[in-house]
Structure formats: structure tokens, C-alpha cells
Interface confidence: medium
């Protein structure tokens, strides 16, 4: 092409028109262009309708183009990634009708001061939304209702003073939330819901530590390993969690998670009873919490409570029965073992009433991996690593999830705009998954002791899985021998809503509790 550079990478025709001092779309671009870079030009205004002839376009970079207006007309049916970062947009165009397949939208570093309620209507496929570095002060309550597949949300570096309580409602796949460097002083009760949030960035806000902060304090305690400090240019999985980075603005930078809450109502941080069944009197011993109540209620949706019941396992069984193919970040341990921090059983456990069904059925048959056929135009090329499809709730184990997307912030000063290093013609919703590994079964029978004052530790090790069994008859404090096969006693089934960033777990895994 006389103006732009054309190249082919992994089945994509990539056209690079960056830094050409263009004021409009160049003529005669290849009709089968799939990735179009128009970064660092002087477009000022741009109409998406001019791209309608490019029916295979899956990624469009319009960052740093001095855009003050984006006209949304026509339809780009397979466009998956739109980068509008580092422009001068004062309002977010309504993209839903024009870009129905959009999975990644980056409007970072513009001049947005507010978002209308229906700003994201029609963007039902959206997985990543980046609004960093704007001038947003508030958000409409139902802003994210149209985007139930959202996985990454960046609202960092704005002027937000408060958040709508239900902002994250229904976002079961959300794994990364960036709220750092705003003017937030509190988090409304119930804000985080009950689903897993593996990566949260909350530092750089003037948190007001009073009785209203107790819900947030408790969430921080329960999710300490999921709270990070943003470092420019560092992959999110390489960062170290740092819950102490969330500091009270009115208490000499005292960490919010340690705020004592003296004089506050006893159940002040319980929030909704669905979210936490809070122990009103607790002693904190470093990372350990001593529970002084005998009822442990787990919500039906998984959340990140790291204080699962404490069980004693035989050392010999761990030596001989740990799975041989552990995830790289998962280590065998001989110490006492609990539920992993990011796993919560899907049941309510009362000490006075617990047994297991008599004949749990073990399984080592993984569900079939989805595959994709060649060739299919790709609706969303920008993700840099394979994402698993939404996990089924059936208990059969499936193959290990693949690595998560490598970065939640594609646009941060002064990094260049995001591009797709390895796009393909594969459709995003059904990637080819690695070969599944049969799930080993632990066969041993130590005693489970459930104490009313059990020590509960957040650090735990995942063991293995079988099919779930129900909770039935009644016993108290200890669980007697049951009429079951001698080597396989019972399991508690858990459900992990979003495991793509979890180093240990597949969504359908559960934990065997031998007796």
C-alpha cells in the first residue's frame, strides 16, 4: 500500500497507518484487513461508517488521534477491539448498535466527565472496559448492567467520590477491578457481592475510616491476597498483593483492614447477611482468625473468604496422594490443609447437623474440551492469552484453564497503545483448550474434627476432587465413621465463579474431605 504498511500475522492481515499525519482514512486499504492501526494521526473527527467495507475488521486502533468526535453510524459486525485512548473525547459515543461484537473498549485518557445511563447498551459481549485517566466524578447505577461478560474494569485515575452500590451486580466474570487514584472515601455495603475478584487495585483513595467503612474493612481482610498496588509496566500476575496499600485518610495512613472500629455497632461490617455471616467477637492473630461461634454459613455463590473450616489431614496421605501434576505455582505441603483462599463451598454447614451421603461417586473423566475449526473470522483478537469459556456448574472436572489475559491496563502513561501481538482467526468464545488431565482422588481416612473454636487460616492448599454428595443426617462436633467404602468417605462441593486468574483451581473442582 502506498501509505500504510501491510503485513500478515497468524491469519490476520494487519495494516499499520500509524504516524502518517493522516486527516482521514486512507483510500484503497485491503478489503480483508483484520487489524487497522491509525494511531498518532490528526483525525480530529472520525466516522466508523467509513470502515464498513472492511467486513473482517476485528481490531481498530484510533488512539492519540486528537479525536474530539467519533461518529457512530453503520455496523462493523465483527469488530472486537476499539482503542480510543489518549484523545479529546468529552462524551462516550453510543457504540452498541454499531459494534455489537465489541469485547474490548479502551477510552482511557480522554476528557469524559460523565457517562449516561445507557452508555454501554448493546455491548453485551464486552469483556474489558478501560476508562482510566478521565474526569469522571460519578457513575450511573446501572452502567454495567448491559455488560454481564465484563472481566476487566478500569476506573483508575478519575475523580470518583462514590460508587453506586449495585455497580458490579451480575458481573460474575469480573476478575480485575482498578479503582486506584480516585477520590473515594467509602465502599457501599454489599458492593463487591459474593463472587470472586482476584485482582483489585484500591490504593490512592482518601478512605474515611469510620463505622461506615466496616463492610469494606471486612472485605479487605477476607480478600487480602487479592488486593494489589498498580505498578506501571508490570504484568498483573507478577505483582505482589498488598492489602496495606489501602489506607485511612483520616488516621495517619493506617491500613483500612486493621481499622479497629472501636465504638461501632457489633455487626456493623456484616453487610447483607447473604454476603457474610460475621463472627461478632474475634481475636486476630496475625493471619489467623479465631471463630467463637459454631455456625459457619457459606453463601451459595463463591466469594473470597479465606477462613474456611480447619481440618487435620494425615501427613502420610499428603505425601502419597498429592496430585503429581501440580500447577507451577501450586506446591505440595505436609502442613495442615484447609480450603484454598479463593474457594468457598456451596453449602451451609451447621456443627450440629452434618454427614455425607453413603456412596459418593468418584470420577476421573474430564468433560470434552471445546475445539474450533479453521478458518473462522475472529470477533475479538486483542486478548493476548487464551481464556476459558464460562465454566459450567456441573461437577464433572474439565481440563485446566489456560493462562489469563496478561494485563488489565492496556493504556497507561507513557506506554504505547495496546496492540494484538498474536491474533488469530479463531473465535474467542470457544478456544481450543489444552488436553485435560484426569483428576486424582485422595484415598485416605483421617478424622475430621470440627471445633467450635477452630483456628482458621487463610493460607491453604488445594487437594483434589470428586463428584459432590449431599449433606444429610445429624451429628455433633465430630463426624463418626459412616457406612461407606473404607477409602473414600465424602466430599463438599464448591463452586468458583471465575477461575481464570486463579493459580490453583478449575471452576468445577471441589475438595475431598476424607473421614
Amino acid at each position: 500500500h502506498p501509505i500504510c504498511e501491510v503485513s500478515k500475522v497468524a491469519s490476520h492481515l494487519e495494516v499499520n497507518c500509524d504516524k502518517r499525519n493522516l486527516t482521514a482514512l486512507p483510500p484503497d486499504l485491503p478489503k480483508d484487513t483484520t487489524i487497522l492501526h491509525l494511531s498518532e494521526n490528526l483525525l480530529y473527527t472520525f466516522s466508523l461508517a467509513t470502515l464498513m467495507p472492511y467486513t473482517r475488521l476485528t481490531q481498530l486502533n484510533l488512539d492519540r488521534c486528537e479525536l474530539t468526535k467519533l461518529q457512530v453510524d453503520g455496523t462493523l459486525p465483527v469488530l472486537g477491539t476499539l482503542d480510543l485512548s489518549h484523545n479529546q473525547l468529552q462524551s462516550l459515543p453510543l457504540l452498541g448498535q454499531t459494534l455489537p461484537a465489541l469485547t474490548v473498549l479502551d477510552v482511557s485518557f480522554n476528557r469524559l466527565t460523565s457517562l449516561p445511563l445507557g452508555a454501554l447498551r448493546g455491548l453485551g459481549e464486552l469483556q474489558e472496559l478501560y476508562l482510566k485517566g478521565n474526569e469522571l466524578k460519578t457513575l450511573p447505577p446501572g452502567l454495567l448492567t448491559p455488560t454481564p461478560k465484563l472481566e476487566k474494569l478500569s476506573l483508575a485515575n478519575n475523580n470518583l467520590t462514590e460508587l453506586p452500590a449495585g455497580l458490579l451486580n451480575g458481573l460474575e466474570n469480573l476478575d480485575t477491578l482498578l479503582l486506584q487514584e480516585n477520590s473515594l472515601y467509602t465502599i457501599p455495603k454489599g458492593f463487591f457481592g459474593s463472587h470472586l475478584l482476584p485482582f483489585a487495585f484500591l490504593h490512592g483513595n482518601p478512605w474515611l475510616c469510620n463505622c461506615e467503612i466496616l463492610y469494606f474493612r471486612r472485605w479487605l481482610q477476607d480478600n487480602a491476597e487479592n488486593v494489589y498496588v498498580w505498578k506501571q509496566g508490570v504484568d498483573v500476575k507478577a505483582m505482589t498483593s498488598n492489602v496495606a496499600s489501602v489506607q485511612c485518610d483520616n488516621s495517619d495512613k493506617f491500613p483500612v483492614y486493621k481499622y479497629p472500629g472501636k465504638g461501632c455497632p457489633t455487626l456493623g461490617d456484616e453487610g447483607d447477611t447473604d454476603l457474610y455471616d460475621y463472627y461478632p467477637e474475634e481475636d486476630t492473630e496475625g493471619d489467623k482468625v479465631r471463630a467463637t461461634r459454631t455456625v459457619v454459613k457459606f453463601p451459595t455463590k463463591a466469594h473470597t473468604t479465606p477462613w474456611g473450616l480447619f481440618y487435620s489431614w494425615s501427613t502420610a496421605s499428603l505425601d502419597s496422594q498429592m496430585p503429581s501434576s501440580l500447577h507451577p505455582t501450586q506446591e505440595s505441603t505436609k502442613e495442615q490443609t484447609t480450603f484454598p483462599p479463593r474457594w468457598t463451598p456451596n453449602f451451609t454447614l451447621h456443627m450440629e447437623s452434618i454427614t455425607f451421603s453413603k456412596t459418593p461417586k468418584s470420577t476421573t473423566e474430564p468433560t470434552p474440551s471445546p475445539t474450533t475449526s479453521e478458518p473462522v473470522p475472529e470477533p475479538a483478537p486483542n486478548m493476548t492469552t487464551l481464556e476459558p469459556t464460562p465454566s459450567p456448574t456441573t461437577p464433572e472436572p474439565t481440563s485446566e484453564p489456560a493462562p489469563s489475559p496478561t494485563t488489565p491496563e492496556p493504556t497507561s502513561e507513557p506506554a504505547p497503545s495496546p496492540t494484538t501481538p498474536e491474533p488469530t482467526s479463531e473465535p474467542a468464545p470457544s478456544p481450543t483448550t489444552p488436553e485435560p488431565t484426569p483428576i486424582p482422588t485422595i484415598a485416605t481416612s483421617p478424622t475430621i474434627l470440627v471445633s467450635a473454636t477452630s483456628l482458621i487460616t487463610p493460607k491453604s492448599t488445594f487437594l483434589t476432587t470428586t463428584k459432590p454428595v449431599s449433606l444429610l443426617e445429624s451429628t455433633k462436633k465430630t463426624i463418626p465413621e459412616l457406612d461407606q467404602p473404607p477409602k473414600l468417605r465424602g466430599v463438599l462441593q464448591g463452586h468458583l465463579e471465575s477461575s481464570r486468574n486463579d493459580p490453583f483451581l478449575h471452576p468445577d473442582f471441589c475438595c475431598l474431605l476424607p473421614l
Epitope: 501491510v6 503485513s7 500478515k8 500475522v9 497468524a10 491469519s11 492481515l13 485491503p30 478489503k31 480483508d32 484487513t33 474450533t372 479453521e374 478458518p375 475472529e378 483478537p381 486478548m383 493476548t384 492469552t385 487464551l386 489456560a402 493462562p403 494484538t420 498474536e422 491474533p423 488469530t424 482467526s425 479463531e426 478456544p431 481450543t432 483448550t433 489444552p434
Partner: antibody, heavy 118, light 113 residues
Framework: EVQLVESGGGLVQPGGSLRLSCAAS????????MSWVRQAPGKGLEWVSS???????YYPDSVLGRFTISRDNSKNTLYLQMNSLRAEDTAVYYC????????????WGQGTLVTVSS | DIQMTQSPSSLSASVGDRVTITCKSS????????????LAWYQQKPGKAPKLLIY???TRESGVPSRFSGSGSGTDFTLTISSLQPEDFATYYC?????????FGQGTKVEIK
């Protein structure tokens, strides 16, 4: 049965021009990317040019500006116009069909020899 | 450009032998989006056009005998002939189909011992 038949090779002087043709049959020609790959005598394979089903051409640096690939879907024919030929362009030129949007070559012609010599 | 390096450049083997040819790329051919490695293998006999054996590292082209298999990931790849047959004596080329310009290895000639 897929068939690719090259023609147009021969002896040409340095600086001269030559046009190669590849007649395709046995498949829907317009739906597939097509390529030229060459092999110098006693040497390995070297990709020369490709054209997508939509008509987008691309080339390696070694022939950029000298060679032009084109296709006539109505005639099921692929072309390679070679200008400013050099001695190092001497090779057997193969016409090859790509699989879908991918860029490996599932069918090859028998090749046509181009000799650039004075 | 991605450089492809094959080894050995030639080898002598007997019918029934297990033969392994390696191919290294100067950068990764793994597309993390779909976990596929964009590498193909071809067989060429003297005076003939190349024939596709394997694509995406390990997928055998239809009609290719099962004794041919491909493996590897990232930058290191292998073509294995489990039991060499008389018709397998030929030159074998790897090709990356990840990023243009498409590049081939220099070839490995498999000769009769």
C-alpha cells in the same frame, strides 16, 4: 482433484522481465489465498509472494518493488510479473495454494524454471 | 523476519529406523490466543514439488501416513518418522506460517544408509 499448472518460465537477461502464470482447477479458486514459492538450483525453498482471496498482495523484501502478484478469478489464474530480474532470481518457481486464511501450502504445482543469465 | 534452522542438514538411516528432524525458530511461533504453534512440515523428492505433511506443528494432512508426527512448542519443533519406509527418503523442510514473510528451514536430506 486440485491441479496447479505453472507456465511462462524461461531464459531472460539480467534486468529483463518475465510473467509467470498458474492455471488452477479442482477447487473454488476465488476463495483461497495463492502464493509463489521458488527454489534455486540445489537450494532450499523461499517464499516469493502471496495474494489473499480479496486480492491483497504481500511480498518479502527481496522482491518488493520488482515483482507483482495478481489473480484473475474469472480465469482461475494466478500471475507473477517479474521485473528487473537478477541472477539470484534464477530458480524453479512453484505456484501454491493456501488452506483457508492460513499460510501453509497444501497444494503445489510442478514448477517452472526461470533462468536469469547473460 | 523469523529465521528457521533445521538440523541435521542430512542424515543416513535404514528402513525401519526411527528418524527425528529438529527445527528451531528465532522467535516463538506460539499464538497464545488459540494455543497453536504455526509450523508446517513438507517432504520433497528430487525433481518434484514439495508435499504438505503436517501443519500447526502436529496436525497431519489427510493421506499422510501415521508414522509421520510433529511435536514442539514455542521455538523448538520436531518431525519424527517412527519407522522409515523406502518412499520416505527425501528432503524435509519446516516452514513457519506465523508471520510474514513466511520462511523455511534449509532442509534435511534423509538418505539411505
Amino acid at each position: 482433484e486440485v491441479q496447479l499448472v505453472e507456465s511462462g518460465g524461461g531464459l531472460v537477461q539480467p534486468g529483463g522481465s518475465l510473467r509467470l502464470s498458474c492455471a488452477a482447477s479442482g477447487f473454488t479458486f476465488s476463495s483461497f489465498a495463492m502464493s509463489w514459492v521458488r527454489q534455486a538450483p540445489g537450494k532450499g525453498l523461499e517464499w516469493v509472494s502471496s495474494i489473499t482471496s480479496a486480492g491483497t498482495p504481500y511480498y518479502p523484501d527481496s522482491v518488493l518493488g520488482r515483482f507483482t502478484i495478481s489473480r484473475d478469478n474469472s480465469k482461475n489464474t494466478l500471475y507473477l510479473q517479474m521485473n528487473s530480474l537478477r541472477a539470484e532470481d534464477t530458480a524453479v518457481y512453484y505456484c501454491a495454494k493456501s488452506r483457508g486464511y492460513e499460510d501453509y501450502f497444501d497444494y503445489w504445482g510442478q514448477g517452472t524454471l526461470v533462468t536469469v543469465s547473460s | 523476519d523469523i529465521q528457521m534452522t533445521q538440523s541435521p542438514s542430512s542424515l543416513s538411516a535404514s528402513v525401519g529406523d526411527r528418524v527425528t528432524i529438529t527445527c528451531k525458530s528465532s522467535q516463538s511461533l506460539l499464538n497464545s490466543r488459540n494455543q497453536k504453534n504455526y509450523l508446517a512440515w513438507y517432504q520433497q523428492k528430487p525433481g518434484k514439488a514439495p508435499k504438505l505433511l503436517i501443519y500447526f506443528t502436529s496436525t497431519r494432512e489427510s493421506g499422510v501416513p501415521s508414522r509421520f508426527s510433529g511435536s514442539g512448542s514455542g521455538t523448538d519443533f520436531t518431525l519424527t518418522i517412527s519407522s522409515l519406509q523406502p518412499e520416505d527418503f527425501a528432503t524435509y523442510y519446516c516452514q513457519q506460517h506465523y508471520s510474514s514473510p513466511w520462511t523455511f528451514g534449509q532442509g534435511t536430506k534423509v538418505e539411505i544408509k
